[in-house]
């Protein structure tokens, strides 16, 4: 199709080489079409404006994204050619940063139902650049935490070094929905609830004498509880002896509950004590079996191919540790009688 009639938007993504970060493009179809498609301007499907020049489907994923190759080749369907780019409804998610993401991206409705619809498309010219050195030493992270129940704020990474007074007008989105209230480079949250968690996007316009473009950054916000003040506790094994059959395989599980820590480095390992000697056992990787806002339960198993007489003289010790302290639980094997 002819893209010369598409409305054009220029965007800049300046990414930090120090951190992982994502990026998004919204299918900003010209008003009033976009409301009909993605409902980003908060109309319900029943409240479609009258006299729509473009009567598309109400299916939220009913847009098609393309990339325009720089060599003039035909448009490429994003889903077929770019595994690191994911389409979610009307949003294109870039999972990894890099200058190779620079280019022109076009979105338009899949269903073309009238002659007006041909021009119902948006061309987004994306420029991707690495952040230049320490233009701002303490720029906000693309991953920000809010402490539940307290006051917090979400900062726009590309503007966090500017004071509120010099900050340009910022457009904020949360999970793809425009936050029409917010205007500054920081969203202040008086009391943090779990619904404040999500993907936030901040946009502002930068201009020079020739043109203007939108500078965009994406912030992943999670709501967290305060760091635990407790060392981890071992849920299993509970008993310090375990009846076993000689010659049979045996798996002993160690399950431990770790309280939430913002910087989470849990340790869970097995070691064996045999008279005066003790050594760590190489066992399968630990796995998280339950994760909640407040804590995480991690399990690690020790596997014996077959229980020997020597194993009955040993103590099998599960050791768990967080930044507060450590806990151990030892198990002595006992031969089953009869």
């Amino acid at each position: 199709f002819n893209i010369s009639g598409c409305s054009t938007k220029k965007l800049l993504w300046t990414y930090s080489t120090r951190s992982e970060e994502e990026f998004v493009l919204f299918c900003d179809l010209p008003e009033p079409q976009k409301s009909h498609f993605c409902h980003r301007n908060r109309l319900s499907p029943k409240q479609v404006p009258e006299h729509l020049p473009f009567m598309g489907s109400n299916d939220l994923s009913d847009v098609q994204w393309y990339q325009q190759p720089s060599n003039g080749d035909p448009l490429e369907d994003i889903r077929k050619s770019y595994p690191h780019i994911i389409q979610d409804k009307c949003t294109l998610h870039f999972l990894t940063p890099g200058v190779n993401n620079s280019g022109s991206y076009i979105c338009r409705p899949k269903m073309i139902k009238s002659p007006y619809d041909v021009a119902c498309c948006v061309k987004m010219i994306l420029e991707v650049k690495p952040q230049t050195n320490a233009s701002c030493e303490y720029s906000a992270s693309h991953k920000q935490d809010l402490l539940l129940g307290s006051t917090g704020s979400i900062s726009c990474p590309s503007l966090s070094c500017q004071s509120d007074a010099q900050s340009p007008a910022v457009t904020w989105y949360k999970n793809g929905k425009l936050l029409s209230v917010e205007r500054s480079n920081r969203i202040v949250v008086d009391e943090v609830y779990d619904y404040h968690q999500g993907t936030y996007v901040c946009d502002y316009t930068q201009s020079d004498t020739v043109s203007s473009w939108t500078v965009r950054a994406v912030v992943q916000v999670r709501t967290i509880v305060g760091d635990t003040k407790l060392k981890p506790d071992i849920l299993d094994p509970v008993e310090d002896t375990l009846e076993v059959e000689l010659g049979k395989p045996l798996t002993i599980s160690c399950k431990a509950r770790f309280g939430f820590e913002r910087v989470f480095n849990p340790v869970i390992k097995w070691y064996i004590k045999d008279s005066d000697l003790e050594w760590e056992v190489s066992v399968p990787e630990a796995k998280s079996i339950k994760s909640t806002l407040k804590d995480e339960i991690i399990e690690r198993n020790i596997i014996l191919e077959k229980v020997t007489q020597r194993d009955l003289r040993r103590k099998f010790v599960c050791f768990v540790q967080n930044s507060i302290g450590n806990t151990t639980q030892s198990v002595q094997l006992k031969e089953k009688r009869g």
Epitope: E31, R42, A165, A169, S180, V181, E182, R183, D190, T205
Partner: antibody, heavy 115, light 111 residues
């Protein structure tokens, strides 16, 4: 500052466009809202146009009004006025920290809808 | 749609007294605190007094204060002056802009 214009006497059903002219600031940086007040009554929030171009309307105002803008003006179109639309119409600018704290208001323009 | 109920509709106060105006929202406002208070005198546009429930707007005397308890918001005028005679409105801003609305207004008469 902001100033409204275009208020006049119209007959029911005749579309009317009111204009809000901004000076001393850029509409590409501030959200603008329209508020009205019928004679002797309270304030009613009509809608907003965001600097990004996004528009939103109060549930009662949807379909009855359209807000649009140019680089220096914001328009409010009353699509099919009825006598109940007789009021003083104000435009108001959003604040620096927030788009809904209206710290700059126009003096208002009076619209009278009558047969 | 959300409902903002402002009470009382009219209140009379002596100079130096205290006036309390309430605004009850049927549901949480945006971010739990997005409610503003405006003062309007006859023939004039409204004037912003309080935003974000309790923040005093620039140039507004400190005798005006705002507070919140859940979905109830209160405007207090301590040490009322003759110049405070006006109608006061609350404006609630919600997650869905279609719900944004002013309260019905409270007329303050100063004796």
């Amino acid at each position: 500052s902001v100033e409204e214009s275009g208020g006049r006497l119209v007959t029911p059903g005749t579309p009317l466009t009111l204009t809000c002219t901004a000076s001393g600031f850029s509409l590409s940086s501030y959200a603008m809202s329209w508020v009205r007040q019928a004679p002797g009554k309270g304030l009613e929030w009509i809608g907003i146009i965001h600097y990004s171009g996004y528009t939103a309307y109060a549930s009662w105002a949807k379909g009855r009004f359209t807000i649009s803008k140019t680089s220096t003006t914001v328009d409010l179109k009353i699509t099919s006025p009825t006598t109940e639309d007789t009021a003083t119409y104000f435009c108001a600018r959003g604040g620096d920290a927030d788009n809904f704290y209206y710290n700059i208001w126009g003096p208002g323009t009076l619209v009278t809808v009558s047969l | 749609a959300q409902v903002l109920t402002q009470t009382p509709s009219s209140v009379s106060a002596a100079v130096g007294g205290t006036v309390t105006i309430n605004c009850q929202s049927s549901q949480s406002v945006y971010s739990n605190n997005h409610l503003a208070w405006y003062q309007q005198k006859p023939g004039q546009p409204p004037n912003l007094l309080i935003y974000r429930a309790s923040k005093l707007a620039s140039g507004v005397p400190s005798r005006f204060s705002g507070s919140r308890s859940g979905t109830q918001f209160t405007l207090t005028i301590s040490g009322v002056q003759c110049d405070d005679a006006a109608t006061y409105y609350c404006l609630g801003v919600y997650d869905d802009d279609a719900d944004n609305a002013f309260g019905g207004g409270t007329e303050v008469v100063v004796k």
